[in-house]
């Protein structure tokens, strides 16, 4: 019979013969022959292959370097890579999460719109009229100005986006 020019899914062509690929988690030891099947071997410790393959070496699991602020989110297996995430207070600098940076703080006059996660930074927003933030924080939202009226007081000093209003007693002298 004519030697094949293409092979089925999960097979590869070598020496005019279709051989089975190795399944995820296993590497190629030797190609099949007319008389023998493909020989595969499971990946070793800290190694993986995540596709049907003919690789002779497995890939190393990603190392979550604590010096870069990284920690293991999900331990790798023979079929999956390790997933890293950042330590508390830090977030990934890229989708691949190869290093981390400290969460940004929102300056006075700005509040936290969205708290940072392991993969996204803090999102800040300017405090609108009626709200203020007088601290630099990665967690604090803009606070509403104090309502002097509800305390039976009057505004003695107007608030800003960075300061609260100052309330004082009502002037009791009437004309």
């Amino acid at each position: 019979p004519e030697p094949p020019t293409a092979c089925r899914e999960k097979q590869y062509l070598i020496n005019s013969q279709c051989c089975s690929l190795c399944q995820p988690g296993q590497k190629l030891v030797s190609d099949c022959t007319e008389f023998t099947e493909t020989e595969c071997l499971p990946c070793g410790e800290s190694e993986f292959l995540d596709t049907w393959n003919r690789e002779t070496h497995c890939h190393q699991h990603k190392y979550c370097d604590p010096n870069l602020g990284l920690r293991v989110q999900q331990k790798g297996t023979s079929e999956t890579d390790t997933i890293c995430t950042c330590e508390e207070g830090w977030h990934c600098t890229s989708e691949a999460c190869e290093s981390c940076v400290l969460h940004r703080s929102c300056s006075p006059g700005f509040g936290v719109k969205q708290i940072a996660t392991g993969v996204s930074d803090t999102i800040c927003e300017p405090c609108p009229v009626g709200f203020f933030s007088n601290v630099s924080s990665a967690f604090e939202k803009c606070h509403p100005w104090t309502s002097c009226e509800t305390k039976d007081l009057v505004v003695q000093q107007a608030g800003t986006n960075k300061t609260d209003v100052v309330c004082g007693p009502q002037d009791r002298l009437r004309a």
């Epitope: 099947e37 020989e39 071997l41």
Partner: antibody, heavy 120, light 111 residues
């Protein structure tokens, strides 16, 4: 019908040697990985050694490494286990087992076993 | 001491379901989907019941099923029958140089 028939077991003194054979029939021998698995009397199973279909790749448990040698003769459909420097703890029924396709870590057909007794 | 931990015995009545656990580590059961289960009747050779965690070889009843969560694999037998009374061994590939490890075996008694 797949058949595996072990032979070569017996009584041997500590430090002695034995060669086990496993005659295979009912399948294309060279297409399957093969293993030896043993079971001490009244105990559990212990994988001993394996070889790929071609016989080039061989694998051994730590407990037998350097003392046992697995080999195969595909022209004779026979698997072998050469056991040297035998110890009392090697006493067991030795099973020849066929690897499931090319996966020698699964055993889909087993022989009836041959008893190896190491004693003085 | 076995590398994989199984209960020494389990029992069930005909028609019931039973589950046998097999606990390993992140170096074996947790790392590989290369878990298998064997049934062994007294004086007989073992028989492959499950491979690759949950795959049944042809000819094995669908009353036998396998699963895995983390570092523990399980064999479930539903609709227990008297013929199911036997020893059951789990096995896994391992990252250690021992390559293949077994559990100590579980004796199943059908009451």
């Amino acid at each position: 019908e797949v058949q595996l028939l072990e032979s070569g077991g017996g009584l041997v003194q500590p430090g002695g040697s034995l060669r086990l054979s496993c005659a295979a029939s009912g399948f294309t021998f060279s297409r399957n990985a093969m293993s030896w698995v043993r079971q001490a009397p009244g105990k559990g199973l212990e994988w001993v050694s394996a070889t790929g279909g071609s016989g080039i790749s061989t694998y051994y448990a730590d407990s037998v490494k350097g003392r046992f040698t697995i080999s195969r003769d595909n022209s004779k459909n026979t698997l072998y286990l050469q056991m040297n420097s035998l110890r009392a703890e090697d006493t067991a029924v030795y099973y020849c087992a066929r690897g499931y396709s090319n996966s020698w870590w699964y055993f889909d057909y087993w022989g009836q076993g041959t008893l190896v007794t190491v004693s003085s | 001491q076995s590398a994989l931990t199984q209960p020494a015995s389990v029992s069930g009545s005909p028609g019931q379901s039973i589950t046998i656990s097999c606990t390993g580590t992140s170096s074996d059961v947790g790392n590989y989907n290369l878990v298998s289960w064997y049934q062994q009747h007294p004086g007989k050779a073992p028989k492959l019941m499950i491979f690759e965690v949950n795959q049944r070889p042809s000819g094995v009843s669908n009353r036998f099923s396998g699963s895995k969560s983390g570092t523990t694999a399980s064999l479930t037998i539903s609709g227990l029958q008297a013929a199911d009374e036997a020893d059951y061994f789990c096995s896994s590939y391992t990252t250690s140089s021992t390559y293949v490890i077994f559990g100590g075996g579980t004796k199943l008694t059908v009451l």
